[in-house]
Amino acid sequence: MMTGTIETTGNISAEKGGSIILQCHLSSTTAQVTQVNWEQQDQLLAICNADLGWHISPSFKDRVAPGPGLGLTLQSLTVNDTGEYFCIYHTYPDGTYTGRIFLEVLESSVAEHGARFQIP
């Protein structure tokens, strides 16, 4: 039975040209995290595998930095980066947990972090 929950940074906003940290955290389970995949709608951004380290997709390699931890830093933001991002935790023996983050990239300097929230 899957007992874990994923806590994410929730709905966040950032300024165009700036950077943002996408962060998820898996709790309430003793399952071993074998890999975390980061995706944006229909594109893979990066994979962090416990044994192999990081894979950064070529379309993002110039502006995605691994970490901190299992998170991902997205740099040189554009308005086109607005949208949903998913952290997909591959665990043993539980299986897969998915968290969702919505990023809004703003033209002005009114960017503020949203509240944290949980997805079971």
């Epitope: 074998t34 890999q35 995949n37 995706e39 229909d42 594109q43 893979l44 990066a46 994979i47 595998n49 416990a50 044994d51 192999l52 380290g53 990081w54 894979h55 950064i56 997709s57 070529p58 379309s59 390699k61 691994p66 591959h90």
Partner: antibody, heavy 119, light 107 residues
Framework: QVQLQQSGAELVSPGTSVKVSCKAS????????IEWIYQRPGQGLEWIGV????????IYNEKFKGKATLTADKSSNIAYLQLSSLTSDDSAVYFC????????????WGQGTTLTVSS | DIVMTQSHKFLSTSVGDSVSITCKAS??????VVWYQQKPGQSPKLLIY???YRYTGVPDRFTGSGSGTDFTFTISSVQAEDLAVYYC?????????FGGGTKLEIK
């Protein structure tokens, strides 16, 4: 120039073991991942596993657990595939392939090592 | 394990024709797919990755597309030297897996 040079063809008896080598040159060995692939005559490619020579971390295809052991010697830039309890089903070409840095895209391949298990 | 299914084991085409090879993943693999070419007696060669980027030195007649579970590899104007087996491969989750291969035959 990046190169992966594999050891030569092997003819071995059933029940024995063999160690295939893959020597890397032209790059920082510990910045690469090395994967191993198996191909029986006239058949497709099958993934055996992958090793991170920097950390020693390995991942295996469940099918090859107990059959294959992946190791790497950082001092000599050599990755090894050891195969044990050999049977005729293990007769195949074994390839090593390398992927640089933050990538799981394997763009450098060895020439292949032919293993024949026969009594 | 994720199964990568290439529906055609063989495809026959003529020089100058366009040909497409399809690959279907048994579950979501996002864009973590590459295509290899293996000519008789040779090691596989990386052609396309991620899954629409052409590897260095690969002619622009080779293209790839897809996301999620459905992927396509296309040769826009087949040349005689394209006689080979083409494999799709996913690295979305371990164990990484290959498609069964599609052998391209030139009429």
């Amino acid at each position: 120039q990046v190169q992966l040079q594999q050891s030569g063809a092997e003819l071995v008896s059933p029940g024995t073991s063999v160690k295939v080598s893959c020597k890397a040159s032209g790059y920082a060995f510990t910045n690469y991942l090395i994967e191993w692939i198996y191909q029986r005559p006239g058949q497709g490619l099958e993934w055996i596993g992958v090793i991170n020579p920097g950390s020693g971390g390995t991942i295996y295809n469940e099918k090859f657990k107990g059959k294959a052991t992946l190791t790497a010697d950082k001092s000599s830039n050599i990755a090894y595939l050891q195969l044990s309890s050999l049977t005729s089903d293990d007769s195949a070409v074994y390839f090593c392939a390398g992927s640089y840095g933050s990538s799981y895209t394997f763009d450098y391949w060895g020439q292949g090592t032919t293993l024949t298990v026969s009594s | 394990d994720i199964v990568m299914t290439q529906s055609h084991k063989f495809l026959s085409t003529s020089v100058g024709d366009s040909v497409s090879i399809t690959c279907k993943a048994s579950q979501h693999v996002s864009t973590a797919v590459v295509w290899y070419q293996q000519k008789p007696g040779q090691s596989p060669k990386l052609l396309i990755y991620s899954p629409s980027y052409r590897y260095t030195g690969v002619p622009d007649r080779f293209t790839g597309s897809g996301s999620g579970t459905d992927f396509t590899f296309t040769i826009s104007s087949v040349q005689a030297e394209d006689l080979a087996v083409y494999y799709c491969h996913q690295h979305y989750s371990t164990p990484w897996t290959f498609g069964g291969g599609t052998k391209l035959e030139i009429k």
